[in-house]
């Protein structure tokens, strides 16, 4: 069975998100994103910043979905 390893808040998620960032990340700082594994206890969108940080976000936040759409289009 898959083990969810711990992460420091919403940053540096190993595989799953346990908490979400409470801040809206400026769009220009984001380079890429990925969706966490569906086996995780809660869903998450991980944004990767230009500085290489991985930030867990809540997929239900409008700004998160807006960023995903923007990145898909571009």
């Amino acid at each position: 069975t898959k083990t969810e390893s711990s992460s420091r808040g919403p940053y540096h998620p190993s595989e799953c998100c346990f908490t979400y960032t409470t801040y809206k990340i400026p769009r220009q700082r984001i380079m890429d994103y990925y969706e966490t594994n569906s086996q995780c206890s809660k869903p998450g969108i991980v944004f990767i910043t230009k500085r290489g940080h991985s930030v867990c976000t809540n997929p239900s936040d409008k700004w998160v979905q807006d960023y995903i759409k923007d990145m898909k289009e571009n």
Partner: antibody, heavy 121, light 106 residues
Framework: CQSVKESEGGLFKPADTLTLTCTVS????????INWVRQAPGEGLEYIGW???????YYASWAKSRSTITRNTDENTVTLKMTSLTAADTATYFC???????????????WGQGTLVTVSS | AVVLTQTPSLVSAPVGGTVTVKCRAS??????LAWYQQKQGQPPKLLIY???KLASGVPSRFKGSGSGTEYTLTIRGVECADAATYSC????????FGGGTEVVVK
């Protein structure tokens, strides 16, 4: 006028599979998310899952293993499928829509009247 | 997971009176809280979002307040039409609803 309406529920047996359809009118699924929420008799509201305006489905942890939410943008419908029903799934099932106006797609201002699903042998 | 505890479960108020409903979260939810009104046999109706912002068309006698883990819905000048069950919803973490508070208007 924007509205959503759930298909008829009814009586199901334990281990049955539930399929409910939410039909939306007055807005497009390409700009709205649809949530499924249920309410057992005399109990509070319980989130099941949602499908985003780009068609990605997400689920509550308890529902993930036996729920599937899909949509048909041509027919303006969203479908909830829930397998392995038990008596604990007896509830009124609501679909609810939101366009993110309230900063989050879980916050819904368009609700259907709900449909009663009873699971009993 | 966040647990939302609503108190009281039942409250009675005279017409024109004031009703206060509390919602406590087991962890901070950063004002990501909504309030819904639900009348018997009807779906929920959104009243308040982001803890204190009134949804479209909601009368100003409804007021939301709070931050961190403690949130309050206040109804001033209660009317007969306000008889309903009121539920809080956190949308910071897992989309959890409170157990509901039934408001009876005398």
């Amino acid at each position: 006028c924007q509205s959503v309406k759930e298909s008829e529920g009814g009586l199901f047996k334990p281990a049955d599979t539930l399929t409910l359809t939410c039909t939306v009118s007055g807005f497009s699924l390409s700009s709205y998310a649809i949530n499924w929420v249920r309410q057992a008799p005399g109990e509070g509201l319980e989130y099941i899952g949602w499908i985003s305006d780009v068609g990605t489905a997400y689920y509550a942890s308890w529902a993930k293993s036996r729920s599937t939410i899909t949509r048909n943008t041509d027919e303006n419908t969203v479908t909830l499928k829930m397998t392995s029903l038990t008596a604990a799934d007896t509830a009124t099932y609501f679909c609810a829509g939101g366009d993110g106006s309230y900063s989050n797609y879980w916050v819904s201002d368009i609700w259907g009247q709900g449909t009663l699903v009873t699971v009993s042998s | 997971a966040v647990v939302l505890t609503q108190t009281p479960s039942l409250v009675s108020a005279p017409v024109g009176g004031t009703v206060t409903v509390k919602c406590r979260a087991s962890q901070t939810i950063n004002s990501r809280l909504a309030w819904y009104q639900q009348k018997q046999g009807q779906p929920p109706k959104l009243l308040i979002y982001e803890a204190s912002k009134l949804a479209s068309g909601v009368p100003s006698r409804f007021k939301g307040s709070g931050s961190g883990t403690e949130y309050t819905l206040t109804i001033r000048g209660v009317e007969c039409a306000d008889a309903a069950t009121y539920s809080c919803q956190e949308y910071a973490d897992e989309n959890i609803f409170g157990g509901g508070t039934e408001v009876v208007v005398k």
